[in-house]
């Protein structure tokens, strides 16, 4: 803003070039091809103006009563095209007795501060100073539309000019454009388009896949009801006014479809009875995934070929398949669904569970005391383990010694070729409780039922063995 600081008003000639005709206070550059703006005055020339005046309350001794202060009439309405330049002014004659004056520009009730092109010029004479405040806008935009006024503060009074209405006309401007949508096949939907001038009216044509939908334009705003689509389409709208036409962005209307199958399924971890998988979802078919299905088939000529189905949420894209058999081969596929339906199953991938622990305990466990050697003999039969338990690597023997006030558990490991073991007597006059479990790479199986034997004090002999019966012999 180039407004001068408040000037002391001093006498001097008023330049002859200053004209009082209110229309001449509007200045517009005449460039090549330039159309002069239209101008309307809110009041007729010469008509007395009584609004927004300041009446001086104080007069110096012997002086005449000063006339009311008011801004001169100027152009009231300027219509011009976007990107043109415009300059408009307000003027006022102020008696020289007023030492400090400032003029400010306001638009739509807010003061225009900062880097606006406002210039105030002073033309002093003997008794009054003519002040012309001009405001210029280069390359006007729609945002420059509005009501502009000048304000002058003088002796704590505020003088306000008539408003100058700036109307920037241009191509239609969209306030609402159609939005991309994902719709169900053959289902009706609406698209909305709204554009404004000035100039008004703004008329709307709808375009589908480069062809106009409506032969007759509709006044903005316009709602297009599409009865339904069977395939993807691109819609846009054309907004027309006297200045020309603006085309909205083209929006794609997608038809919801079943998703594509996942594009990657990975095995992350396998245990004896579970497999952790992840997948990368395929294209969602323009409809969010709802859930996924993990399908599992056992790859075994002897299996009945049935498929286990595990339903899970669509996210995270990971699932731990449980309740599987140990040391088994599985074929795994993943399918996901959206509101339309299920995707095809991904290509089947292969995965194997690891060895499991044995599911049965050793059989016919017998325990007897060999007093001469001061040890306990333990014998058993190899359990009938399933193939899934994997290869037997040995046995774990638990023996617990209990006597008055003490209890002590010891564990022994023996190799898979053994079916007997000897353990040293730990405590006399005590009960020894023996249990045996089979061991594979998959882990330790269940322990056999406990077999108890009493270890007497030294010198007392009983060779009678203790045993667990074999299954079916009880």
């Amino acid at each position: 803003r180039e407004e001068a600081k408040p000037y002391p008003l001093f006498p001097g000639p008023l330049p002859g070039s200053l004209q009082t005709d209110h229309t001449s206070l509007l200045s517009l550059p005449h460039t090549s091809g330039y159309q002069p703006a239209l101008m309307f005055s809110p009041t007729q020339p010469g008509r007395p103006y009584t609004g927004n005046v300041a009446i001086p309350r104080v007069t110096s001794a012997g002086s005449k009563l000063l006339p009311p202060l008011a801004f001169k009439h100027t152009v009231g309405h300027i219509i011009l095209s976007e990107h043109k330049d415009v300059k408009f002014n307000c003027s006022i004659s102020v008696p020289n007795i007023y030492q400090d004056t400032t003029i400010s520009w306001w638009k739509d009730g807010k003061e225009l501060l900062g880097a606006h092109h406002a210039i105030t010029q002073f033309y002093p004479d003997d008794e009054v100073t003519a002040i012309i405040a001009s405001f210029s806008i280069t390359s006007v935009q729609r945002s420059d539309n509005g009501s502009y006024i000048c304000k002058m503060k003088i002796n704590n009074e505020e003088i306000v000019s008539d408003p100058i209405y700036i109307e920037v006309q241009g191509l239609p401007h969209f306030t609402k454009q159609p939005e991309s949508m994902n719709v169900t096949r053959n289902t009706a939907f609406n698209l909305t388009c709204q554009a404004v001038g000035p100039p008004e009216p703004v008329n709307i044509f709808w375009v589908q896949n480069s062809s106009r939908v409506n032969e007759q334009p509709e006044k903005s705003p316009s709602v297009l009801t599409v009865p339904g689509l069977t395939e993807m389409a691109v819609f846009s709208c054309e907004a027309h006014n006297d200045k020309g036409l603006t085309v909205s962005k083209g929006v794609q209307i997608n038809i919801k479809a079943i998703p594509s199958p996942p594009t990657e399924v990975s095995i992350h971890n396998s245990t004896a009875h579970s497999i952790l998988i992840s997948w990368v979802p395929g294209f969602d078919g323009y409809s969010p995934f709802r859930n996924c299905s993990v399908q599992v088939k056992e790859v075994d000529p002897l299996s009945n070929g049935s498929v286990m189905i595990f339903n899970t949420s669509a996210s995270p894209h990971m699932y731990q398949i449980k309740q599987l058999q140990a040391l088994a081969n599985y074929s795994i596929g993943v399918s996901c669904m959206n509101e339309i339906g299920w995707s095809a199953v991904s290509p089947w991938i292969l995965a194997s569970t690891t060895e499991g622990a044995p599911s049965v305990a050793p059989l016919n466990v017998t325990v007897f005391l060999n007093e001469s050697r001061d040890n306990v003999d333990i014998r058993w039969m190899k359990p009938l383990t399933k193939r899934q338990a994997g290869e037997l690597v040995g046995y774990r023997i638990s023996h617990v010694w209990q006597s008055a006030g003490i209890s002590k558990e010891l564990l022994e490991e023996v190799g898979q070729n053994n079916s007997r073991a000897q353990i040293s007597v730990q405590v006399h006059n005590a009960t020894c409780t023996v249990r045996i479990a089979a061991v594979t790479k998959g882990g330790v199986g269940p322990f056999s039922d406990p077999v108890k034997i009493f270890i007497p004090a030294h010198g007392w002999v009983d060779h009678a063995p203790s045993s667990t019966p074999a299954p079916g012999n009880a």
């Epitope: 990657e264 294209f283 290509p347 991938i349």
Partner: antibody
Framework: QSVEESGGRLVTPGTPLTLTCTVS????????MSWVRQAPGKGLEWLGI?????DPVYATWARGRFTISRTSTTVNLKITSPTTEDTATYFC????????????????WGQGTLVTVSS | AQVLTQTASSVSAAVGGTVTISCQSS????????LSWYQQKPGQPPKLLIY???KLASGVPSRFSGSGSGTQFTLTISDVQCDEAATYYC????????????FGGGTEVVVT
């Protein structure tokens, strides 16, 4: 949907070269990608795969000679120390489905970019 | 190492005739069926024809068919057309840690 390779040019032996693959119409966050090459007048050779969920997997002969990497928008193939035997057209290819680095099928091929290694 | 062998490097066929191309895998391909076939014309990239041994890729004429499982696979083109003169490659996925994919050496089809 399309795949496009770039970066192929004449290089001298031993000068590292990086080829870039850009895609459109689909997302690299969804698909594994492979590189395949073809020497003039010869057959197709698979170099490796960069998956979404696991580390890159290379053909045995290609390990150490090539590095495959990916960003959110590109897949890159670095020829670490080219020899004259690496003169070929290099194709970037979308993998329709994969598991643990095993491609199921290669369904979308780029036009290829020619690399010439000569002193 | 994974090897796919296409025994015939070139085969001829008359227009309207039938062509059979074989592909042998060692070892067996992943899941017994992860084998695909590709067509390559001079100056062009390969194009997917068949996957999972027998499934037709999108947009491929039904005159192309595939069969086989495990280690032996066949591509058949019936009612051969002139523009199907090309080199055909088999390719397979394998379950080892590396070399998880390999191409056969290719078979050129000459249409007379």
């Amino acid at each position: 949907q399309s795949v496009e390779e770039s970066g192929g040019r004449l290089v001298t032996p031993g000068t590292p070269l990086t080829l870039t693959c850009t895609v459109s119409g689909f997302s690299l966050s969804t698909y594994s990608m492979s590189w395949v090459r073809q020497a003039p007048g010869k057959g197709l050779e698979w170099l490796g795969i960069v998956s979404v969920a696991i580390d890159p997997v290379y053909a045995t002969w290609a390990r150490g000679r090539f590095t495959i990497s990916r960003t959110s928008t590109t897949v890159n193939l670095k020829i670490t120390s080219p020899t004259t035997e690496d003169t070929a057209t290099y194709f970037c290819v979308r993998v329709a489905f994969s598991t643990n680095g095993i491609p199921h099928r290669l369904d979308l091929w780029g036009q290829g970019t020619l690399v010439t290694v000569s002193s | 190492a994974q090897v796919l062998t296409q025994t015939a490097s070139s085969v001829s066929a008359a227009v309207g005739g039938t062509v059979t191309i074989s592909c042998q895998s060692s070892p067996s391909v992943y899941n017994h069926n992860w084998l695909s076939w590709y067509q390559q014309k001079p100056g062009q990239p390969p194009k997917l024809l068949i996957y999972e041994a027998s499934k037709l890729a999108s947009g491929v004429p039904s005159r192309f068919s595939g069969s086989g499982s495990g280690t032996q696979f066949t591509l058949t083109i019936s009612d051969v057309q002139c523009d199907e003169a090309a080199t055909y490659y088999c390719a397979g996925g394998f379950s080892s840690g590396s070399d998880s994919f390999a191409f056969g050496g290719g078979t050129e089809v000459v249409v007379t």
